[in-house]
């Protein structure tokens, strides 16, 4: 990408990411080089007629390093130390073409969870207070709860009452995404206010 | 039926501060994100942020981090934006607006303009 | 961040014809979200979830799109159309809005 504008690329942890570079047409290239925040990571001086050299000179990253044939960049088993500003510089007897990217790493979701803490009025009616998580959530983790199609919260929290004498068995579930995956996970309302009802009895018993 | 309606417009002079209301209604306040938008005269919206209106844990956009402050009254479902240090770039035009999940914001508020001026 | 560029920034057209604009992301996005704004209001829920008209909005409209490239169509303009449409992503944090497409009457 070599407008002013990266060029924002997703990578899954622990998966691979091509960062696609683009050669100018009909010229003969010098050499490549590649950065990531500022910091050389490899350059390379392509051959006509041999395998081009390729000089790593990031031993951090170097193991997980690889080229295509196009000299794009492809980086393996990511992790989010990886995450941040990559450019390329081609250059030609001419002139040196400039390409930016920035890599964001994304996990996928995973270990949705939810945790009850509800309780039973006198009335018998049952407050339900829901809690959904994921493993590593971060702020690009969207959650929400639904029940028959309709959004009853945009949080990890839900909290709602459920009245077994009116309403018919309810399930809500809870609905976790990124850019890269969704995980959802549904609880009932009457089977949670049957077992608040349970530790309700006991506790008068 | 479901609305937010903010408090009134703000003359305010530089290094001032300002607290803008969002009172909700027609709906669980406590089970819906509360984002705050700000559209300054003739420009785009820009997001500045939201908070958890269960948890009252504020999340701000880079950009309005430091004098920029979320906050909530349970108790008569109010969200509140502070903004102390007022300059003159902060006259804008701030809008709340209410997620629906997936950041989809269903429900904005009327506006409350902020004029900084001396 | 991502950034989100409108393509056309104004288009000017006549009640009864057809209005397309785009909404281009600098990056990969699950959905793309709509809004209308009109002088002197607050944006209206537009399209959520790239396809979905929200509750008020006339058949007219439609959007499509997905990865980096999203649509807004109206099919025929209504003068009650002519207004500035506004593209937002939610699949990264900060959530982004587009600069906005104006449709004016011509």
């Known amino acids: 990408q070599s407008s002013l504008t990266p060029l924002m690329v997703n990578g899954i942890l622990g998966e691979s990411v091509t960062l696609p570079l683009e050669f100018p047409a009909g010229e003969k290239v010098n050499f490549i080089t590649w950065l990531f925040n500022e910091t050389s990571l490899a350059f390379i001086v392509p051959h006509e007629t041999k395998s081009p050299e390729i000089h790593v000179t990031n031993p951090k990253q170097g193991k997980r390093l690889n080229f295509t044939q196009s000299y794009s960049l492809q980086l393996s088993n990511l992790k989010m130390e990886d995450t941040g500003s990559y450019r390329a510089q081609i250059s030609t007897k001419t002139s040196a073409k400039l390409s930016s990217y920035t890599l964001r790493i994304l996990r996928q979701l995973r270990n949705i969870q939810v945790t009850n803490h509800s309780q039973l009025f006198q009335n018998m009616t049952c407050e339900l207070h829901l809690t959904c998580s994921v493993e590593d959530a971060d702020d690009n983790v969207s959650f929400r709860w639904e029940a028959l199609g309709n959004t009853l919260s945009s949080q990890p929290n839900l909290t709602v009452s459920w009245d077994p004498r009116i309403s018919s068995e309810q399930d809500y579930t809870c609905i976790a995404e990124n850019a890269v995956s969704n995980l959802s996970f549904s609880v009932s309302a009457q089977k949670l206010c049957e077992d608040v009802k349970i530790q309700y009895t006991d506790t008068k018993m | 039926q479901i609305q937010l309606v903010q408090s009134g417009s703000e003359l305010k002079k530089p290094g001032a501060s300002v607290k803008v209301s969002c009172k909700a209604s027609?709906?669980?306040?406590?089970?819906?994100?509360m984002n705050w938008v700000k559209q300054a005269p003739g420009q785009d919206l820009k997001w500045m942020g939201w908070i958890n209106t269960y948890s009252g844990e504020p999340r701000y956009a880079d950009d309005f981090k430091g004098r920029f402050a979320f906050s909530l009254d349970k108790s008569v479902n109010t969200a509140y934006l502070q903004i102390s240090s007022l300059k003159a770039e902060d006259t804008a035009v701030y809008f709340c607006a209410r997620d629906y999940g997936r950041w989809y914001f269903d429900v904005w508020g009327q506006g409350t303009t902020v004029t900084v001026s001396s | 961040q991502i950034v989100l560029s409108q393509s056309p920034a104004t288009l000017s057209l006549s009640p009864g014809e057809r209005a397309t604009m785009s909404c281009r992301a600098s990056s990969s996005v699950s959905h793309m979200h709509w809004y209308q704004q009109k002088p002197g209001q607050a944006p209206r829920p537009w399209i959520y979830?790239?396809?979905n008209l929200a509750s008020g909005v006339p058949a007219r409209f439609s959007g499509s799109g997905s990865g980096t490239d999203y649509t807004l169509t109206i099919s025929s303009l209504e003068p009650e159309d002519f207004a500035v449409y506004y593209c937002?992503?939610?699949?990264?944090?900060?959530?982004?809005f587009g600069g906005g497409t104006k449709v004016e009457i011509k």
């Open positions: 027609g709906y669980t306040f406590t089970n819906y994100g």
């Open positions: 937002q992503q939610w699949s990264s944090t900060p959530r982004t």
């Open positions: 979830a790239t396809s």
